[in-house]
């Protein structure tokens, strides 16, 4: 476990002609904030793929108002580091995505509006525990200067944060069951990771991958009771006086989880389950409100109007997790037929069809459509020896000559109006509701349903479909 840290030094117009004067010209005052997304490996991943290593959002920067005659400056930035905790090993190779967002502070319905100003992607190799790496990146006409590093958090050490160590409890020797953690003289190494499945209660190991049983237990994983013994149930190093194994420290000893979080042991480490309103490796991050935009991937933040009340993220289809940070693997359902390749684009699933097949799910054999015509932009699809038309939006019937109503299913909730726009259906919500389908009340139970950022939904904010 550890933390990836990013420090933004400056963001402003890049050199050369055509550089923008301001991020918010003609839009009134605005302020900046940053989102960092970490993905494992060096591959060119789709922008929409999940931030599997983690993501973080900065605080808002100071308000910026363009001075018409002033030279374009570096823009006022949020204070502090962006920190992305990671639970597992640091992969060494990773993709770093930094997004610069503009928050417009004009008179917006339901609060400010957000838009993406710049996005840089770096694919790098980086060892944990190393020095800060500095970088300058251009994004369009903007220039971003930043530094980053990865550091382990005790008990993890090493370039991948996989060696488990604890500080010495005494100047001259390690605590029970711990050895000095070479070459780090001020730390001690925790017991090695035992064989998978080795009983946490009745087994232990001195070398990685082994499973030695405590007295009174037997079997390859120490799960079979043997003869009874006064030492039963104890684990740890042998006691010279009793010959019994005495309890050694476990990862959850002393409960490393703050703020009422509950600790559960994982192989060689621990995991905290945090109460609502807290998150982080040890539930140490608190005071987060909807105004901080904790919901990723377009999640809608509800509640959390002040630091003392918890927020909840309502995730859009395809995402899950307390902050909508995890992508649901919709391709695992194998929706593409006839050998089609499934691509999860985030906003939609797409199938890349093999030659001779077509349709949203590659379900149509193209051979039966020779010489067949579909009106109004419809496409012909095979249907058991007979052709049929897959009609463009707004049309229906056998040959797509009839008008169809995308609003027929009444998709706009709570009295919202659905319009059959050429770009897809559009909802106009009744007063008091918001969301692309008017599904969220603006003031449920007296608590304002604040939108997530970025980009989030604004009250009554329509979306194209």
């Amino acid at each position: 476990a550890g933390v990836f840290e990013l420090q933004i030094h400056s963001f402003g117009p890049g050199p050369g002609p055509g550089a923008p004067r301001s991020p918010c010209s003609a839009r009134g005052p605005c302020r900046l904030f940053f989102r960092v997304c970490l993905k494992p490996g060096l591959s060119e991943e789709a922008a929409e793929s999940p931030c599997a290593l983690g993501a973080a959002l900065s605080a808002r920067g100071p308000v910026y108002t363009e001075q018409p005659e002033a030279p374009a400056p570096d823009l006022p930035l949020p204070n502090g580091l962006l920190q992305v905790p990671f639970r597992d090993a640091w992969p060494g190779t990773f993709s770093l995505i930094i997004e610069t967002w503009r928050e417009e502070l004009g008179d917006q319905i339901g609060g400010p509006a957000w838009s993406l100003l710049a996005r840089v992607t770096r694919r790098r190799r980086l060892a944990a525990g190393g020095p800060w790496a500095r970088d300058i990146q251009r994004a369009g006409a903007w220039e971003l200067r930043f530094s980053y590093r990865a550091r382990c958090e005790l008990p993890a050490v090493g370039t991948a944060c996989t060696r488990l160590c604890r500080p010495r409890s005494a100047p001259s020797r390690c605590g029970p069951g711990l050895r000095p953690c070479a070459p780090l003289e001020d730390e001690c190494e925790a017991p090695p990771v035992c064989r998978a499945g080795c009983s946490l209660e009745h087994g232990f190991c001195e070398q990685p991958g082994e499973c030695r049983c405590l007295e009174g237990w037997t079997g390859p994983l120490c799960t079979v009771p043997a003869s009874t013994s006064s030492c039963l149930g104890l684990r740890g190093p042998s006691s010279a006086t009793t010959g019994c194994l005495v309890p050694g420290p476990g990862p959850c000893d002393g409960n490393p989880c703050a703020n009422g979080g509950s600790c559960s042991e994982t192989p060689g480490s621990f995991e905290c389950t945090c109460p609502r309103g807290f998150y982080g490796l040890r539930c140490e991050v608190s005071g987060v409100t909807c105004a901080d935009g904790p919901c990723f991937n377009g999640g809608l933040c509800v509640g959390g109007a002040d630091p003392d009340s918890a927020y909840i993220c309502h995730c859009p289809p395809g995402f899950q997790g307390s902050n909508c940070e995890k992508r649901v693997d919709r391709c695992s359902l194998q929706p593409c037929r006839n050998g089609g390749l499934c691509l999860d684009l985030g906003h939609a699933l797409r199938c890349r069809c093999r030659a001779g097949f077509a349709g949203p799910r590659c379900e149509h054999n193209l051979d039966d459509c020779a010489g067949r015509a579909c009106a109004n932009g419809g496409t012909c699809v095979e249907g058991g020896g007979a052709h049929r038309c897959s009609c463009a939006l707004g049309f229906g019937g056998r040959d797509c000559r009839e008008r169809a109503d995308p609003c027929a299913a009444r998709p706009c909730a709570h009295g919202g109006r659905c319009y059959a726009h050429f770009s897809g259906l559009v909802c106009a919500c009744a007063p008091g509701y918001m969301g692309s389908r008017c599904e969220f009340p603006v003031h449920p139970d007296g608590v304002s349903a604040l939108p997530a950022a970025p980009p989030g939904l604004r009250p009554g904010d329509p979306q194209r479909h």
Epitope: D107, Q108, I109, A113, G394, R403, A404, D405, P406, C407, R410, R417, C418, Y419, A420, H421, F422, S423, L425, V426, A428, C429, P431, R458, G460, D461, P462
Partner: antibody, heavy 118, light 109 residues
Framework: QEQLVESGGGLVQPEGSLTLTCTAS?????????MCWVRQAPGKGPEWIAC???????TDYASWAKGRFTVSKASSTTVTLQMTSLAVADTATYFC???????????WGPGTLVTVSS | QVLTQTPSPVSAAVGGTVTISCQST????????LSWYQQKPGQPPKVLIY???NLEIGVPSRFKGSGSGTQFTLTISGAQCDDAATYYC??????????FGGGTEVVVK
Amino acid sequence: QEQLVESGGGLVQPEGSLTLTCTASGFSFSSSYDMCWVRQAPGKGPEWIACIYTGDGSTDYASWAKGRFTVSKASSTTVTLQMTSLAVADTATYFCARNSGYGYFGLWGPGTLVTVSS
Amino acid sequence: QVLTQTPSPVSAAVGGTVTISCQSTESVYGSDWLSWYQQKPGQPPKVLIYQASNLEIGVPSRFKGSGSGTQFTLTISGAQCDDAATYYCQGYYSGYIYAFGGGTEVVVK
């Protein structure tokens, strides 16, 4: 080709009544739109009067138009505007227009002139 | 809901740039449900821009809309003689309410 055509305009005396009709072709009101009436007095800008939402028949009016103007759907291709207690200030070209999303009028009729005069 | 357009009239040379402002007394629905129309004598208004910045199909790219909330702008870059007309902004508001601006006459010399 989608089209709107207004009819029913003409000369009417003050305090008189008139019903305008908007006829659609190339599409029908089975889809969901706001079918609206907008008027424009000579030399002035357009002024929204009222709409009927074809999805459920609900109606909306400009505050000044409530009571004297009534919009209704007569058939799957016609919408009417009933006007009562007409005054000289109601003299204008009356347009039928369609909002099919994002609150703008993407389709207009050519308009019909209503003159209120004694 | 009142939409105020400035300036009127506005004059530009062929190839010049015209900027028209539209201010609303309250935020339009979704902060961007505002459209711009061009009208010539004897014709109904013709939509140029919808949803503040989206160009209607078939409209030349020299027309550009921007803004959000209560403040919006229509810019004509490289004005042509054919652009001489009256331009109107129109907003849609929560509660299914529509309103038009007073109009800006554009003269191209």
